[in-house]
């Protein structure tokens, strides 16, 4: 019967006794940087070309005996997971292997860098179709390795890496921490994070998504027909490399940003038990398990958005945190979050010709996060309209006044440490959805965009009594672009988007009174693109 991991990534309409997805990734080449491999295993023979690239350190220990099957174990298994005939994800993908890990599974940053350069040169000499590079390795944070990954990604190569098996924040490791790389954590058959001895999968904001990574059956280098079960984020990354190969084979023109957005969009949502992660990492870690799209074509009409968390600002009074979108993405909204609730809001600002989301810590605060909502919006023209703090008691307001521009997000930022928390909440006048409303002491920022066929609407959900969390979701066919809290409440920790749901978090209810200021309203801005929908219908 079908191995559990292949069943897990397969949409229900393709499920059968055998895993036979519609396109095997035949137009894509996957580079594997790992150990040596047993290329004559019948699972991968003829599918994997062993390049002459080898850059590995000496094995440790005088009593170490090289045994071919042990040296090849990790790489052979991963090659099988990506493109194996029988237990592989992308059965049509061809692979090239580069040896950057020795027989003990150890490598060097310099060896990996030279390997990446080898791929870049190969690509220049003989351009082929889409390229996926699988980096099933993790070492300490390396600015130089991350920079090399960025360069290769900007040359159009899709890089997929393991989050690491240290039960730690993936941002502390490379290449997992490189923003341009698709970083993959590991889950098991119960969709729970994988435990590996006393350690386990890495987590945190640098992880893009999770994938099957425990008891994964794959080619064993022991013999030509042998199979073995292995576990780890390397196996998880191999699944995503395979899924990416299939998506790119179906749509070869996909950019890295489009591919990442699709991987996120088609993932299974909210199935991971977050209790496994450290409490401070739960909100930062994506609750996504990779899956193949239900159809390899026709996803182009959707407005895709993802949430990008910044690094923590740190606790100093004037500390800020910045969240950035990928070069091909539009920043459609910006929000902030602080566990202590002490923050001075957030603003969208230009940096290097691109909008970024900046959150501001407040005096006595433990630090803030900036949260960017990053979307794929072709031909978009977006700008930020700012209203300074108002004199009137009605609060500050700003709207999108340019013809054809629609509101995609609201941010508010204040200079004062205390917003006058005992003022009654400000209510938005009905029938004015295209404007942002805030405290009179705050400056308000509206993200206004013009794009063909773009339409947006505001959706609110208010709860009169104090709640730790208030949510509002966009309905089917609409995509969440903006998430904020209606002003007037003292205990809001911040707002952020989780998939298509806007989440507004408040302080522990027991610490706040149930006065009128206890009311919390979550405000979602939901958008869709009629232009994208029409374009896709024309293609079909």
């Amino acid at each position: 019967s079908i191995p559990w991991n292949l069943e897990r990534i397969t949409p229900p309409r393709y499920r059968a006794d055998e895993y036979q997805p519609p396109d095997g990734g035949s137009l894509v080449e996957v580079y594997l940087l790992d150990t040596s491999i047993q290329s004559d295993h019948r699972e991968i023979e003829g599918r994997v070309m062993v390049t002459d690239f080898e850059n590995v350190p000496e094995e440790d220990g005088t009593r170490f005996h090289r045994q071919a099957s042990k040296c090849d174990s990790h790489g052979t298994h991963l090659a099988g997971v990506v493109s194996g005939r029988d237990a592989g994800v992308a059965k049509g993908a061809s692979m090239r292997s580069l040896r950057v890990l020795n027989c003990q599974g150890k490598g060097t940053v310099s060896g990996t860098l030279i390997g990446l350069e080898f791929i870049r040169k190969s690509q220049l000499v003989q351009p082929v179709g889409p390229l996926v590079v699988l980096l099933p390795l993790a070492g300490g944070y390396s600015r130089v390795l991350n920079a090399a990954c960025q360069r290769l990604a900007r040359a159009g190569v899709v890089l997929v890496t393991a989050a690491g098996n240290f039960r730690d924040d993936a941002c502390l490791y490379s290449p997992a921490s490189a923003p341009e790389v698709i970083t993959v954590g590991a889950t098991n058959a119960q969709d729970q994070p994988v435990t590996l001895g006393t350690l386990g999968t890495n987590f945190g904001r640098c992880v893009d998504l999770f994938a099957p990574g425990e008891d994964i059956i794959g080619a064993s280098s022991d013999c030509s027909t042998c199979f073995v079960s292995q576990s780890g984020t390397s196996q998880a990354a191999a699944h995503v490399a395979g899924i990416a190969a299939m998506m790119l084979s179906a749509e070869p023109e996909l950019t890295l940003a489009e591919l990442r957005q699709r991987l996120i969009h088609f993932s299974a949502k909210d199935v991971i038990n977050e209790a496994w992660f450290p409490e401070d990492q739960r909100v930062l870690t994506p609750n996504l398990v990779a899956a193949l799209p239900p159809s390899t074509h026709g996803a182009g009409w959707q407005l895709f958005c993802r949430t990008v968390w910044s690094a923590h600002s740190g606790p100093t009074r004037m500390a800020t945190a910045v969240a950035r979108c990928a070069p091909d993405e539009e920043l459609l909204s910006c929000s902030s979050f602080s566990r202590s609730g002490k923050r001075r809001g957030e603003r969208m600002e230009a940096q290097g010709g691109k909008l970024v989301c900046r959150a501001h810590n407040a005096f006595g605060g433990e630090g803030v996060y900036a949260i960017a909502r990053c979307c794929l919006l072709p031909q978009a023209n977006c700008s930020v309209h700012t209203a300074p703090p108002a004199e009137a008691s009605m609060g500050t307001r700003v709207h999108c006044h340019q013809q054809g521009h629609v509101l995609t997000g609201c941010s508010s930022h204040w200079e004062v440490e205390d917003l006058g928390t005992h003022k009654p909440p400000v209510l938005r006048p009905r029938g004015q959805p295209n404007q942002c409303v805030g405290h009179r002491e705050a400056s308000i920022h509206a993200s206004c965009c013009h794009a063909p066929g773009l339409e947006c609407k505001v959706k609110e959900h208010g709860i009169p009594a104090p709640q730790e969390q208030v949510t509002v979701a966009c309905e089917e066919g609409w995509t969440l672009t903006g998430c904020s809290a209606l002003p007037g409440t003292s205990h809001v920790l911040g707002a952020y988007a989780v998939d298509n749901t806007c989440v507004v978090r408040s302080r522990d209810v027991s610490t706040t009174g149930s006065t009128s200021e206890g009311a919390v309203t979550a405000v979602a801005i939901c958008c869709r693109s009629r232009h994208l929908a029409q374009a896709s219908q024309e293609l079909q």
């Epitope: 064993s220 022991d222 030509s224």
Partner: antibody, heavy 119, light 113 residues
């Protein structure tokens, strides 16, 4: 039920070409390997090679490499064994058998095709 | 190539008696990754194709009578017919399926004494 049905017996002259077949039914033909096994009169079993119909990957025994060609047509769930120029020493019973990645032994065999090469 | 050697070449056993066939491989077919022996036993009756009896050296194929059993590990294996029946008259082959080319033993002919 699962079965492999082979084409009928053949009598050929040396130098002639021949293609015998093995049709699978009752299972997903593309997901199983098909091997060909030779048994010369009064002798034992010799593995000749195999094919994976899913992608037409083949692997031959060195003893048979270049002597025969294994192919498959997955649209009709059929594997083939062919000779471009038969020799008298090719006289034998030829069996096809299937195996699976997690069960790499031959659990189902065809009934055999007797090939006689004689001038 | 892994060479499979069976002994004896032929065996005559009385009905109801035990028949034992040995098979030796030139290199181990036991693999640490899954702790399995990549060895099978087949029975071939006159005019019929071979039939799978035992796989993974000791696992009986469904429908095979329990008088057939396989044992051994690494390089030395045994097929035992605990109580020979008339219908067991056949040639028995061991096979390794771990490495290419796949190889068979030369066969052991079992007859009734």
């Amino acid at each position: 039920q699962v079965q492999l049905v082979q084409s009928g017996a053949e009598v050929k002259k040396p130098g002639e070409s021949l293609k015998i077949s093995c049709k699978g039914s009752g299972y997903s033909f593309t997901n199983y390997y098909i091997s060909w096994v030779r048994q010369m009169p009064g002798k034992g079993l010799e593995w000749m090679g195999m094919i994976y119909p899913g992608d037409s990957y083949t692997h031959y025994s060195p003893n048979f490499q270049g002597q025969v060609t294994i192919s498959a047509d997955k649209s009709i769930s059929t594997a083939y064994l062919q000779w471009s120029s038969l020799k008298a020493s090719d006289t034998a019973m030829y069996y096809c058998a299937r195996d699976y990645w997690s069960k790499p032994y031959f659990d189902v065999w065809g009934q055999g095709t007797l090939v006689t090469v004689s001038s | 190539d892994i060479v499979m050697t069976q002994s004896p070449d032929s065996l005559a056993v009385s009905l109801g008696e035990r028949a034992t066939i040995n098979c030796r491989s030139s290199q181990s077919v036991l693999y640490s990754s899954n702790n399995k022996n990549y060895l099978a036993w087949y029975q071939q009756k006159p005019g019929q194709p071979p039939k799978l009896l035992i796989y993974w050296a000791s696992t009986r194929e469904s429908g095979v009578p329990d008088r057939f059993s396989g044992s051994g590990s690494g390089t030395d294996f045994t097929l035992t017919i605990s109580s020979l029946q008339a219908e067991d008259v056949a040639v028995y082959y061991c096979q390794q399926y771990s490495s290419f080319p796949i190889t068979f033993g030369q066969g052991t002919k079992v007859e009734i004494k």
